[in-house]
């Protein structure tokens, strides 16, 4: 004969656990039904009564099976700085994430507590590093024979251009400008291409890159806010 | 409004039994959920539990006192009654009666009735 | 059975004062924890149910918190009329009181 199935509420067997969805009540010594996701007990089982559930109210939330007295409260509304990518319902929490243009200083469990707007690199300084979701932008100085002319945060070093008569030579912070005849750009083998951070909608369709000719000085700057002789700026 | 008052004897002699009726209004011991309890306070000491009833006839008991207690429920009347046997002075205390939420905290309390046990 | 140790068992403020008491249980009682307040001669009175949760009409001063074993009651800036004795009540597992905090003013 097949074991008979039981219904909540149940004693389980000595050293058994209870069932998928059923918690073990330490009152009743019993196996009870979890209430499902959206729900929370109102009234907790008995050893003849099983849990009674009831919806969560609104901007409350239960995410898992559970047996809780009262659902979760929903994290407050997203802040200017960010976009609701989850909204709270009774099943999940709400989720804000930082809009483009800016990083997560401050993550917490799910989403955002704190974002920050992406270091923008000064002109004569180019992007090392490109923000992400959860990291800002680092600049470094434009080595000799690069340079970029943008307060931003997606812009390289790009080469200078390569005149066949210079009129003005290129310094970090402006490209060289050639006589009349047309300039031919120089080309380094192998460079790599920087790609564009996830947190912003700038659309860089051929970021140049840097020049193997010189020798390179560049650093990198740290991730903390830099003064503007450092070549960044918090705009 | 909830309201709960207890009632039974000031004065039990050792060894007696003492029955105790709690009177309550507002809720029922028929809905779903709906539980009354009883706790004591012996003079200047803490409060402890004692027994309660759920609204199916389920009951509950103080592990260390199980065997002096029985509570029994008249759903008609609005009444629980806890009887609790062999009384000694020690059992000397204020006795409340209280409901208990679906999620088994105590919310709503009766005002209490002083139970003396001396021969 | 649960026990809860419930400290100090009483203790002397100013009025303004924040006031803290805590319960410690034997054993995990997954948040299930209540707060009374019972003045001299009176039944004790729900102030707080599941850790944190504030019973209707009950003054935003006083406030609770914990996990697992541990729990913190706290009164943000100690009345005159909140003079009484405080209980903690676990009802995890059963239901036990804790021994009581009693609070008076300096």
């Known amino acids: 004969l097949p074991a008979q199935v039981a219904f909540t509420p149940y004693a389980p067997e000595p050293g058994s656990t209870c069932r998928l969805r059923e918690y073990y009540d330490q009152t009743a010594q019993m196996c009870c039904s979890k209430c499902s996701p959206g729900q929370h007990a109102k009234v907790f089982c008995t050893k003849t009564s099983d849990t009674v559930c009831d919806s969560c109210e609104d901007s409350t939330y239960t995410q898992l099976w559970n047996w809780v007295p009262e659902c979760l409260s929903c994290g407050s509304r997203c802040s200017s700085d960010q976009v609701e990518t989850q909204a709270c319902t009774r099943e999940q929490n709400r989720i804000c994430t930082c809009r483009p243009g800016w990083y997560c200083a401050l993550s917490k469990q799910e989403g955002c507590r704190l974002c920050a707007p992406l270091r923008k690199c000064r002109p004569g300084f180019g992007v090392a590093r490109p923000g992400t979701e959860t990291s800002d932008v680092v600049c470094k100085p434009c080595a000799p024979g690069t340079f970029s002319n943008t307060t931003s945060s997606t812009d390289i070093c790009r080469p200078h251009q390569i005149c066949n008569v210079v009129a003005i030579p290129g310094n970090a912070s402006m490209d060289a400008v050639c006589t009349s005849t047309s300039p031919t750009r120089s080309m380094a083998p192998g460079a790599v291409h920087l790609p564009q951070p996830v947190s912003t909608r700038s659309q860089h369709t051929q970021p140049t890159p840097e020049p193997s000719t010189a020798p390179s000085t560049s650093f990198l700057l740290p991730m903390g806010p830099s003064p503007p002789a450092e070549g960044s700026t918090g705009d | 409004q909830v309201t709960l008052k207890e009632s039974g004897p000031a004065l039990v002699k050792p060894t007696q039994t003492l029955t105790l009726t709690c009177t309550f209004s507002g809720f029922s011991l028929s809905t779903s959920g709906m539980g009354v309890g009883w706790i004591r306070q012996p003079p200047g000491k803490a409060l402890e539990w004692l027994a309660h009833?759920?609204?199916?006839?389920?009951?509950f008991y103080n592990p260390s006192l199980k065997s002096r207690l029985t509570i029994s429920k008249d759903t008609s009347k609005n009444q629980v009654v806890l009887t609790m046997t062999n009384m000694d002075p020690v059992d000397t205390a204020t006795y409340y009666c209280?409901?208990?939420?679906?999620?088994?905290?105590?919310?709503?309390w009766g005002q209490g009735t002083t139970v003396t046990v001396s021969s | 059975d649960v026990q809860m140790t419930q400290s100090p068992s009483s203790l002397s403020a100013s009025v303004g004062d924040r006031v803290t008491i805590t319960c410690k249980a034997s054993q995990d009682i997954n948040k299930f924890i209540a707060w009374y307040q019972q003045k001299p001669g009176k039944a004790p009175k729900l102030l707080i149910h599941y850790t944190s949760t504030l019973q209707p009409g009950i003054p935003s001063r006083f406030s609770g918190s914990g996990s697992g074993r541990d729990y913190t009651f706290t009164i943000s800036s100690l009345q005159p009329e909140d003079i009484a004795t405080y209980y903690c009540l676990q009802y995890g597992n059963l239901w036990t009181f804790g021994g009581g905090t009693k609070v008076e003013i300096k």
């Open positions: 209280a409901r208990l939420t679906g999620t088994r905290y105590f919310d709503y």
């Open positions: 009833i759920w609204w199916d006839d389920d009951k």
